[in-house]
Amino acid sequence: FSPLRRISIKILVHSLFSMLIMCTILTNCIFMTMNNPPDWTKNVEYTFTGIYTFESLVKILARGFCVGEFTFLRDPWNWLDFVVIVFAYLTEFVNLGNVSALRTFRVLRALKTISVIPGLKTIVGALIQSVKKLSDVMILTVFCLSVFALIGLQLFMGNLKHKCFRNSLENNETLESIMNTLESEEDFRKYFYYLEGSKDALLCGFSTDSGQCPEGYTCVKIGRNPDYGYTSFDTFSWAFLALFRLMTQDYWENLYQQTLRAAGKTYMIFFVVVIFLGSFYLINLILAVVAMAYEEQNQ
C-alpha cells in the first residue's frame, strides 16, 4: 500500500472521522431549514461541500473507485454520497437555467445520516427487504384491483353523470342545446338541482331502487362527473382509482353513496365484497409481509 492509501485507511477507520461527518450532516440539515439564509451561509455551504468531497476522496483512496469487490462505487450507500457531491458542484458551477429544481437534490444530504448511524442503516435495510418481499403481494393487489375495476367499469360506466334537470326551459332551448352551452358553475346551478351546501348536482338513476329527483326535475345524463370530474367509473384508469380509494378507505362512504344513488341499492353487494377483500384482507396481508420482513432482518 502506498503511504497515501495507508493514511486514508487510518482516517477512514478513525471514530473521530465518523463523528465529524455526522456533525457536518446535522449542521448542514439545520442550515437547510433556514427560511431566508444570510449571505455568509454561502461560504458555510462551500465548507460542507468541501468536507463531503474530502470524505469521498478518503473513501476512494482507501478502497479504490470502482474496480474490485469492496471499492467505493460497489457500496450502494456511497452512490448517495457521490450524487450529493455531483449535484453540489453542478448547482454551483454549471449554469443550468432552472437551478431551483436541482437545489431540491440538496435535501439528499439529510439521507447521508442513514449511512452514518448504524441502527438506522439496519432499519432502512429491513425496509428495502420488505419492499422486495412485497412484490408478490403487490402483484396480487394490482390484479384484484384491476378485476374489480373492470367489473365497476361494466356496472357503473357513465352512471355518475346522472343529474336532476329542471323541467322548464326557454322556447328555443332543448336538452342538446343546453348540453353544448354548459360551462360555468352558474349554468349548472341554473339547470340542475343542488342540495343546500352541495358543490355537485343531485345524483339520480333510472332504475326503481336508485335515487329519484324532486318534483319539477327529471333525471338526465349530462355534464361532468362529481368532484370536479375526478370521481367516476368511465374509464379503466378512473375505475382503478375509485377501487384504490375503496381499498384505502379514503372517504369511501361518499363514493359508495354517490354510486348507489346513481345505480341502485342492489349494487351494495359490490361494495361489500370490495371492502372485505380489498380493505380488510389485502391491506392486512401487506402489513403481515412487512412485519415478517422486519422479523427476519432482526434475526
Epitope: 323541467n167 322548464s168 332543448t174 336538452l175 333510472f206 327529471t218 338526465v220 345524463k221
Partner: nanobody
Framework: EVQLVESGGGVVQPGGSLRLSCATT?????????TGWYRRVPGKERELVAR???????NYADFAKGRFTISRDNAKKTVYLQMNSLRPEDTALYYC?????????????????WGQGTLVTVSS
Amino acid sequence: EVQLVESGGGVVQPGGSLRLSCATTSRAFIRDVFTGWYRRVPGKERELVARIYNGGNTNYADFAKGRFTISRDNAKKTVYLQMNSLRPEDTALYYCLFSGTINTGREYRSGDYWGQGTLVTVSS
C-alpha cells in the same frame, strides 16, 4: 334503432282540425324532460309549436296559444297535438322531439331525438 313514430298529418281545409300523435313505444325511450312538436315552414328555421314536460306542465308558441293543445298518455307512451282553427300559414312539416334519455343497451344517453316528420297541409 331509436325511432319516434309520428302520425295524423294530412290535408285539411282552413278552420279545420287535426290530431297529431307521437309514440315513443320503443323500450329504448327511458325518460323525457319534455316531448314536443316543432314545425318547419319551407325557407324558414324549425320552430317550437308546443311541448309537454315530464311533470305535465306545457309550453306553447305564441301562434299556437288558444288553438293548439298538447297532451300525453303515459300508459301508451304517446304525446298528442290537437290542432284546431287551422290556417293556411300552418302548412308545414311537423316534427316530434323527444328530449330526454334513451337506453342504447350498453349505456344511458341523454339528448334530442327527432322524428321523421309528418306533413300538414291547410288549403281550400
